[in-house]
């Protein structure tokens, strides 16, 4: 989990240090002079002792994946398409997900994390079948895979924070025009 | 408003090259992959590749890689589709297009208003 | 991958309903919920009507909407207009390798 500290890395404050801070929750972003800080809330410590910590400082991938996660989604419910996760569309059908029948060698060949590759990039993502996954691009490989974001988010955290990262706008409160960017044709 | 603005029509002899430009406006370019689509006269369309702005990272149709190039600069918001030497057949209006969300795989709901290219000797 | 497979013409009288098919394969249609409509007018850039098979973009009718069954995706237009005449294109993902692929069009006449 992460550590709180001023400036210093992990291992420069556990060695100057008894106590361990462990990071209960990532609450906000902020980027500071083209520095990413996080604020954080600390197990055991009220909101008042929250603090705003350097990205490279942290080290608890899970939570500020997570919280990225809750970002997007939230970003997406904020949109102007009537404030729906979803545009106005009929009810998906689900049923049509199940996976056509392939050749016996195809439907055998691994895919996605047990393909044993090291994940490079997101290159995408979709919920279209219910569930949000990702499109993810391997290292020393062409083909990409759709993989869970869930999985993804546990095996790969730094990969998904990058995708988020770069995918979404922060801190620059949505004009007129950016809020109703994703409703023109 | 979201914008692309595509450099205008061009004429030009096979062998020669050219490159075409694609500028967004109205949003964050580096958030959105660009997608270039190609329509030869009284044909459909055909996708060519797309390019992530804020890396210049590209995918490329098998039917288009090592015939065309893709690039960025950020710097300008404007993306590129260029050719070293053109032939005739390469003679379409092309469309540079931006998806509705930031990470949508492979449909795209903003378009630029196409650039006519004809090759011809 | 090889285009996806349209009707080349389709047609239908005011206010009546018309689907387009869109057929592909296991490896693009059949393997992901990711098929995408156009409509395009003469002269015009193409539109987004229905994208991840069934979604609609805002400002787009609720008289179109979008399915799949197996390989074959579907466009459907109910009550139709005078200004639903024009070019229709599906797309779909197909593999990181081929990335998207476009069906050949369908002309869409209103009687």
């Known amino acids: 989990m992460g550590k709180k500290q001023n400036k210093k890395k992990v291992e420069e404050v556990l060695e100057e240090e008894e106590e361990e801070y462990v990071v209960e929750k990532v609450l906000d972003r902020r980027v500071v002079k083209g520095k990413v800080e996080y604020l954080l809330k600390w197990k055991g410590f009220s909101d008042e002792d929250n603090t705003w910590e350097p990205e490279e400082n942290l080290d608890c991938p899970d939570l500020i994946a997570e919280f990225l996660q809750s970002q997007k989604t939230a970003h997406e419910t904020d949109k102007s398409e009537g404030g729906k996760r979803k545009a106005d569309s009929d009810s998906e059908d689900k049923g049509e997900e199940s996976k056509p029948k392939k050749k016996k060698e195809e439907s055998e060949k691994p895919r996605g994390f047990a393909r044993g590759l090291e994940p490079e990039r997101i290159i995408g993502a979709t919920d279209s079948s219910g569930e949000l996954m990702f499109l993810m691009k391997w290292k020393n490989s062409d083909e990409a895979d759709l993989v869970p974001a869930k999985e993804a988010n546990v095996k790969c955290p730094q990969v998904v924070i990058s995708f988020y990262e770069e995918r979404l706008t922060w801190h620059s409160y949505p004009s007129e025009d950016d809020d109703k960017k994703d409703d023109k044709n | 408003a979201v914008q692309l603005v595509q450099s205008g029509a061009e004429v030009k002899k096979p062998g020669e090259s050219l490159r075409i430009s694609c500028k967004g406006s109205?949003?964050?370019?580096?958030?959105?992959?660009i997608s270039w689509v190609r329509q030869m006269p009284g044909k459909g369309l055909e996708w060519m590749g797309r390019?992530?702005?804020?890396?210049?990272?590209?995918n490329y149709s098998p039917s288009f890689q090592g015939h065309v190039t893709i690039s960025a600069d950020k710097s300008i918001s404007t993306a590129y589709l260029q050719w070293s030497s053109l032939k005739t057949s390469d003679t379409a209006m092309y469309y540079c297009?931006?998806?509705?969300?930031?990470?949508?795989?492979?449909?795209?709901?903003?378009w630029g208003q196409g650039t006519l290219v004809t090759v011809s000797s | 991958a090889s285009a996806l497979t349209q009707p080349a013409s389709v047609s239908g009288s005011p206010g009546q309903s018309i689907t387009i098919s869109c057929t592909g394969t296991?490896?693009?249609?059949?393997?992901?919920?990711?098929v995408s409509w156009y409509q395009q007018h003469p002269g015009k850039a193409p539109k987004l009507m229905i994208y991840?098979?069934?979604k609609r973009p805002s400002g787009v009718s609720n008289r179109f909407s979008g399915s799949k069954s197996g390989n074959t995706a579907s466009l459907t237009i109910s009550g139709l207009q005078a200004e639903d005449e024009a070019d229709y294109y599906c797309?779909?993902?197909?593999?990181?390798?081929?990335?998207?692929?476009f069906g050949g069009g369908t002309k869409l006449t209103v009687l």
């Open positions: 797309c779909s993902y197909a593999g990181s390798s081929t990335f998207a692929v």
């Open positions: 296991s490896s693009d249609v059949g393997s992901y919920n990711l």
């Open positions: 297009a931006r998806p509705l969300q930031t990470y949508s795989i492979a449909s795209v709901g903003h």
């Open positions: 390019i992530d702005p804020s890396d210049s990272y590209t």
């Open positions: 991840e098979g069934s």
């Open positions: 109205g949003y964050s370019f580096t958030s959105y992959w």
